[in-house]
C-alpha cells in the first residue's frame, strides 16, 4: 500500500564532472523498519520478473553486506527516517534517474530522484533589481543550483575583472526542500558604474576559476555637467564680458532640459548651453552654474564664482559693543562693499583721523570715558577710496565718579539730633537713579541723594553713601562722630568681695561703658543726699548708719546718666540691746510681767538668752521673757544676750521690783 | 545656703498665659537684682529681662515686649515671670538669676521650669 | 544690641589636653574703669548654666583652677588647660556691660 510511504527531498540535483552530490532525503514507512535498501541509476520495471532492472549503484541487505565497489556511494540513512545519499565523486553517466528501491517487512516502494551531471560546472546565475539608481543601496545576488559536503566552492564578485571591496554574504542551502549555494553584495553604485561590467565567479576550494555570470550595469544618474568660463580665472570689471559653456559628461537616461542658475535662483530665458553676459555690473558677481535635467532629476555643474571689480562703497561703522563700560574692550569694524577687499583704512574719532590705525579692525582693550564720540571711517583698494560714511556713535558708560558723603549738620552732632547728609558725585554716564546708605536704617530720605537721620542714635559711629546708575559707586565713610551722655552708668563694689561686715574697709566703684566726649564727672549720691564727687566712694570702717540705697552719676558735656540704684547692706553683731518691762519695772505680786530683749541686729537675732541678777541663765530663748504670775522673789536685774550669724551682743541690767499685794500685807 | 527654688513644669494651649515662680532664700533678696533667662529644647539661652526687687522696677527684651510682665513679693522673697499669648515657639525651659552685686554676672541660678506650649 | 559669635560650635576633647574657646563681640567690652564685663558659664547636660569666669578672667568659687579666661575689648577665649570627663557640657559667654544682656551661640564639648 504506497499510501503508507511518504518522501521528502530535492526533486533535482545538480552537478559537474568530478564533483560530488549529496542527496537530503527524509521517508516514513509506518508499518516497521526499513529491511532492504537498492539504488538503481535509471530503474526500470520488469512486468515478466514483477522487480527492478537497472544499474544497482547502492544494496544493503538483511545481513547489512555491501558490495566493495559500492565506496563511491553512501547510504546515510537509517531505517526508519532518514534516507540521505552522497555520491562522491559523480561523474557524467550518473545523470539520469535515481531509484531509491525500499523494502520493509511487507511493503515496497521505489522512489525516484533526477540527477544532473554535466561535462564541466555549470555557470552561477547573477540576479539584479528591476532598476538601480546612483547612490541607492542595491543587493546583488549570485545564484548556484549545487552545494556538496564533499566539495567546497566559494562565489567571488568582480566589477571590471577587479575584486570588489564590499563584503559579501554566502550561504548555503541543503535541506530537503532546496539544494544551492547563494552569494549576497550589497553595493551602492555611483554613476560612474554605468555600463561597467560585473561578475560572479566560481571558484574551488583553492580558488580555481571553475565558471562565471557576468551582467553589465544600467545604472540610472542624473546628468553629470562641467562648466567652463571665459575669462578663465572669473574675474573682471564692471563693464567686461563673460561667456560660460555647459557640457554634459554623462547621462542616463538622456538630459531633457537646460537651464542656468546665479546663487541659487534661476536666470530667466537662459536655456542653451552657453550663457553670455555683457558690460557686467557689481550685482551680477556671485556663484554662477548650469542645470540639465533627465528623467532622475536635475543635475548641477561646479559652481563658477563671478568676481566683478569695483572700488570701495561708502563705509559704516559697526561697535561691538555700544555702549561700552568702562574698562571694558571694544572693537569698531569698518565695513564697506568693494572687491577686491580693501587694502587700507583711515579711522576718524570726532571727525579727526586717528594715527596710525590702517587696519579693518580697531581694538580698544581698555576704554576710558574720552573714548565716547563718533567713529567713521574710509576704505580703499586698487580701484579706488571709497566715501566716508555716517559713523556710529560709541556710549561710554561708567560707575558715577568722586563719589563722597557730606554731612550737612553744624558739628558736634548730639545724641538726639537730625542729622542730614547728602550724597554727591562728580560725573555719571548713564544718569544717577538711585542712591544707597550704609548701613541701613529706618531713616528718610526726603528727596534723591539726600538722607535725614531722626533722632540720631549714639552708637551711629559712620554713615557711607553710594551714587547708583547701573552700578553702584561707594563713598568712603564719614564719622559722624555723635556725642553722648555717658552710658551703662553701674555701681561696682570693688571690695570687700564677700558680704560686707560692720567696721570693714568698703570701696564702691562707679563704672560706665562708654562717653563722647570723654571728659567726666562723678556723684555719688545716698537716698537723695550728695556724697561724694569722685570715681569712687571709700569707706574706712563701714557702719550700719551707711547702708541703704546708692547711686552714681556720671556728667559729661552732654548730659548726665545714673546708675540703677544699689543696696548697701552692712551685716553686724547684735548692739543697742535694753531690757524693756510691761506694764513697767515695778510690777505687783501676782500680776502678770513681761520683759522685752530689744535689740539692732543685720542679719536679726537668731537666738535670745536670759539671765538674772546671779548671770544664771534662765530657760528662756525667745524675745520676750513672761513671767505670770509674777512673785516678790523674781524681783532683781536681768539682761539679754542676742546671737546673730556676725556675733553676741548684751543688755545692760535692768531692775525689776516685785511689791507686796494689800492682801498680803493685810495678812501680816 | 544660697539658693533659687521655681515652681514645677507647665503644660499650656497657644493663645494661654503662664506664671512661673522664682524664691530666693540665704541671702538678703531686696540687696540683688534678678533676671529671667530661657532656653528652646536643642537652643542656646536668650535674655527675657530683669528686675529690680527693692523698688520692683523692670526692664524686657524688645522681643517680648509687651507679653512679659515681671514682679516680686518681697514679703515671700519670691520673683515671678508671666508670659501671655504663648505659642509653640515659647516652648522652653525657664530659669531665674540672680546678677552678682559686684560684677553683674548672673552667680546663682533657679533649678528651671519646663513650659510646653502645644 | 550687643551681638557675641562664638567658635567653635563643636569641639571634640581628647581628655588630658587643653581646649580653648573664642567668644567675639560686636563692640568693646571694656569699661571706663577698665574691667571686661565678659562672663563664661558652663552647663553641664540636664543641668542649669553655672558661673566660671565674670569679668573676663576672675574664677568664680568653687570653680577649679584648670580654668582661665583671657582677652579685652572685643575678643575673649576660656581656656582649660587640661580637659577632664566633667567638663563635657556646653559653654557659654554673656556680656554683662548692658542691657540687654547677650549670650553667645555655645560650644558643645564633647569627648572624643
Known amino acids: 500500500d504506497s499510501s503508507k510511504w511518504v518522501f521528502e527531498h530535492p526533486e533535482t540535483l545538480y552537478a559537474w564532472e568530478g564533483a560530488c552530490v549529496w542527496i537530503p532525503c527524509t521517508y516514513r514507512a509506518l508499518d516497521g523498519d526499513l529491511e532492504s535498501f537498492i539504488l538503481f541509476h535509471n530503474p526500470e520495471y520488469n512486468k515478466n520478473t514483477s522487480k527492478f532492472d537497472g544499474t544497482r549503484l547502492y544494496e544493503s541487505t538483511k545481513d547489512g553486506k555491501v558490495p566493495s565497489e559500492q565506496k563511491r556511494v553512501q547510504f546515510l540513512g537509517d531505517k526508519n527516517k532518514n534516507c540521505t545519499l552522497s555520491i562522491h565523486p559523480v561523474h557524467l553517466n550518473d545523470s539520469g534517474q535515481l531509484g531509491l528501491r525500499m523494502e520493509s517487512k511487507t511493503e515496497k516502494w521505489m522512489e525516484r530522484i533526477h540527477l544532473n551531471v554535466s561535462e564541466r560546472p555549470f555557470p552561477p546565475h547573477i540576479q539584479l533589481p528591476p532598476e538601480i539608481q546612483e547612490s541607492q543601496e542595491v543587493t546583488l545576488t549570485c545564484l548556484l543550483n549545487f552545494s556538496c559536503y564533499g566539495y567546497p566552492i566559494q562565489l567571488q564578485w568582480l566589477l571590471e575583472g577587479v575584486p570588489m571591496r564590499q563584503a559579501a554574504v554566502t550561504s548555503t542551502s541543503l535541506t530537503i526542500k532546496s539544494v544551492f549555494t547563494r552569494s549576497e553584495l550589497k553595493f551602492s553604485p555611483q554613476w560612474s558604474h554605468h555600463g561597467k561590467i560585473v561578475t560572479c565567479q566560481l571558484q574551488d576550494a583553492d580558488g580555481k576559476f571553475l565558471s562565471n555570470d557576468t551582467v553589465q550595469l544600467n545604472v540610472k544618474h542624473t546628468p553629470k555637467l562641467e562648466i567652463k568660463v571665459t575669462p578663465s580665472d572669473a574675474i573682471v570689471r564692471e563693464g567686461d564680458s563673460v561667456t560660460m559653456t555647459c557640457e554634459v559628461s554623462s547621462s542616463n537616461p538622456e538630459y531633457t532640459t537646460v537651464s542656468w542658475l546665479k546663487d541659487g535662483t534661476s536666470l530667466k530665458k537662459q536655456n542653451t548651453f552657453t550663457l553670455n553676459l555683457r558690460e557686467v555690473t557689481k550685482d551680477q558677481s556671485g556663484k554662477y552654474c548650469c542645470q540639465v535635467s533627465n528623467d532622475v532629476g536635475p543635475g548641477r555643474s561646479e559652481e563658477v564664482f563671478l568676481q566683478v571689480q569695483y572700488a570701495p562703497e561708502p563705509s559704516t561703522v559697526q561697535i561691538l559693543h555700544s555702549p561700552a563700560v568702562e574698562g571694558s574692550q571694544v572693537e569698531f569694524l569698518c565695513m564697506s562693499l568693494a572687491n577686491p577687499l580693501p587694502t587700507n583704512y583711515t579711522w576718524y574719532h570726532n571727525g579727526k583721523e586717528m594715527q596710525g590705525r590702517t587696519e579693518e579692525k580697531v581694538h580698544i582693550p581698555k576704554i576710558l570715558p574720552w573714548h565716547a564720540g563718533t567713529y567713521s571711517c574710509v576704505a580703499e583698494n586698487i580701484l579706488g577710496t571709497g566715501q566716508r560714511g555716517p559713523g556710529a556713535e560709541l556710549d561710554v558708560q561708567y560707575p558715577p565718579k568722586k563719589v563722597t558723603t557730606v554731612i550737612q549738620n553744624p558739628m558736634p552732632i548730639r545724641e538726639g539730633d537730625t542729622v542730614t547728609l547728602s550724597c554727591n558725585y562728580n560725573s555719571s554716564n548713564p544718569s544717577v537713579t538711585r542712591y544707597e546708605w550704609k548701613p541701613h536704617g529706618a531713616w528718610e530720605e526726603p528727596s534723591l541723594g539726600v538722607l535725614k537721620i531722626q533722632n540720631v542714635g549714639w552708637d551711629n559711629t559712620t554713615i557711607a553713601c553710594a551714587a547708583c546708575n547701573s552700578w553702584c559707586s561707594w563713598a568712603s565713610p564719614v564719622a559722624l562722630n555723635v556725642q553722648y551722655a555717658p552710658r551703662d552708668v553701674r555701681v561696682r563694689k570693688i571690695k570687700p568681695l564677700s558680704e560686707i561686715h560692720s567696721g570693714n574697709s568698703v570701696s564702691l566703684q562707679c563704672d560706665f561703658s562708654s562717653s563722647h566726649p570723654k571728659e567726666v564727672q562723678f556723684f555719688w549720691e545716698k537716698n537723695g543726699r550728695l556724697l561724694g564727687k569722685e570715681s569712687q566712694l571709700n569707706f574706712d570702717s563701714i557702719s550700719p548708719e551707711d547702708a541703704g540705697s546708692y547711686s552714681c552719676w556720671v556728667n559729661n558735656s552732654i548730659g548726665q546718666t545714673a546708675s540703677k540704684a544699689w543696696t548697701l547692706e552692712v551685716l553686724y553683731a547684735p548692739r543697742r540691746l535694753r531690757v524693756s518691762m510691761s506694764p513697767g519695772d515695778q510690777v505687783m505680786e501676782g500680776k502678770s510681767a513681761t520683759l522685752t530683749c530689744e535689740s539692732d541686729a543685720n542679719p536679726p537675732v537668731s537666738h535670745y538668752t536670759w539671765f538674772d541678777w546671779n548671770n544664771q541663765s534662765l530657760p528662756y530663748h525667745s524675745q520676750k521673757l513672761r513671767l505670770e504670775p509674777v512673785k516678790v522673789q523674781h524681783s532683781g536685774a536681768y539682761w539679754c544676750q542676742g546671737t546673730n550669724s556676725v556675733g553676741k551682743g548684751r543688755s545692760p541690767l535692768s531692775t525689776l521690783t516685785v511689791y507686796y499685794s494689800p492682801e498680803t500685807i493685810g495678812r501680816r | 545656703q544660697v539658693q533659687l527654688v521655681q515652681s514645677g513644669a507647665e503644660v499650656k494651649k497657644p493663645g494661654a498665659s503662664v506664671k512661673v515662680s522664682c524664691k530666693a532664700s540665704g541671702y538678703t533678696f531686696t540687696s540683688y537684682y534678678m533676671h529671667w533667662v530661657r532656653q528652646a529644647p536643642g537652643q542656646g539661652l536668650e535674655w527675657m529681662g530683669i528686675i529690680n526687687p527693692s523698688g520692683g522696677s523692670t526692664s524686657y527684651a524688645q522681643k517680648f515686649q509687651g507679653r512679659v510682665t515681671m514682679t516680686r513679693d518681697t514679703s515671700t522673697s519670691t520673683v515671678y515671670m508671666e508670659l501671655s499669648s504663648l505659642r509653640s515657639e515659647d516652648t522652653a525651659v525657664y530659669y531665674c538669676?540672680?546678677?552678682?552685686?559686684?560684677?553683674?554676672?548672673?552667680?546663682?541660678w533657679g533649678q528651671g521650669t519646663l513650659v510646653t506650649v502645644s | 544690641e550687643i551681638v557675641l559669635t562664638q567658635s567653635p560650635l563643636s569641639l571634640p576633647v581628647t581628655p588630658g589636653e587643653p581646649a580653648s574657646i573664642s567668644c567675639r563681640s560686636s563692640r568693646s567690652l571694656l569699661s571706663y574703669h577698665g574691667y571686661n564685663y565678659l562672663d563664661w558659664y558652663l552647663q553641664k547636660p540636664g543641668q542649669s548654666p553655672q558661673l566660671l569666669i565674670f569679668v573676663g578672667s576672675n574664677r568664680a568659687p568653687g570653680v577649679p583652677d584648670r580654668f582661665s579666661g583671657s582677652g579685652s575689648g572685643t575678643d575673649f577665649t576660656l581656656n582649660i588647660s587640661r580637659v577632664e570627663a566633667e567638663d563635657v557640657g556646653v559653654y557659654y559667654c554673656?556680656?554683662?556691660?548692658?542691657?540687654?544682656?547677650?549670650f553667645g551661640q555655645g560650644t558643645k564639648v564633647e569627648i572624643k
Open positions: 554673656m556680656q554683662s556691660l548692658q542691657t540687654p544682656r547677650t
Open positions: 538669676a540672680r546678677e552678682d552685686s559686684g560684677s553683674g554676672a548672673f552667680d546663682i
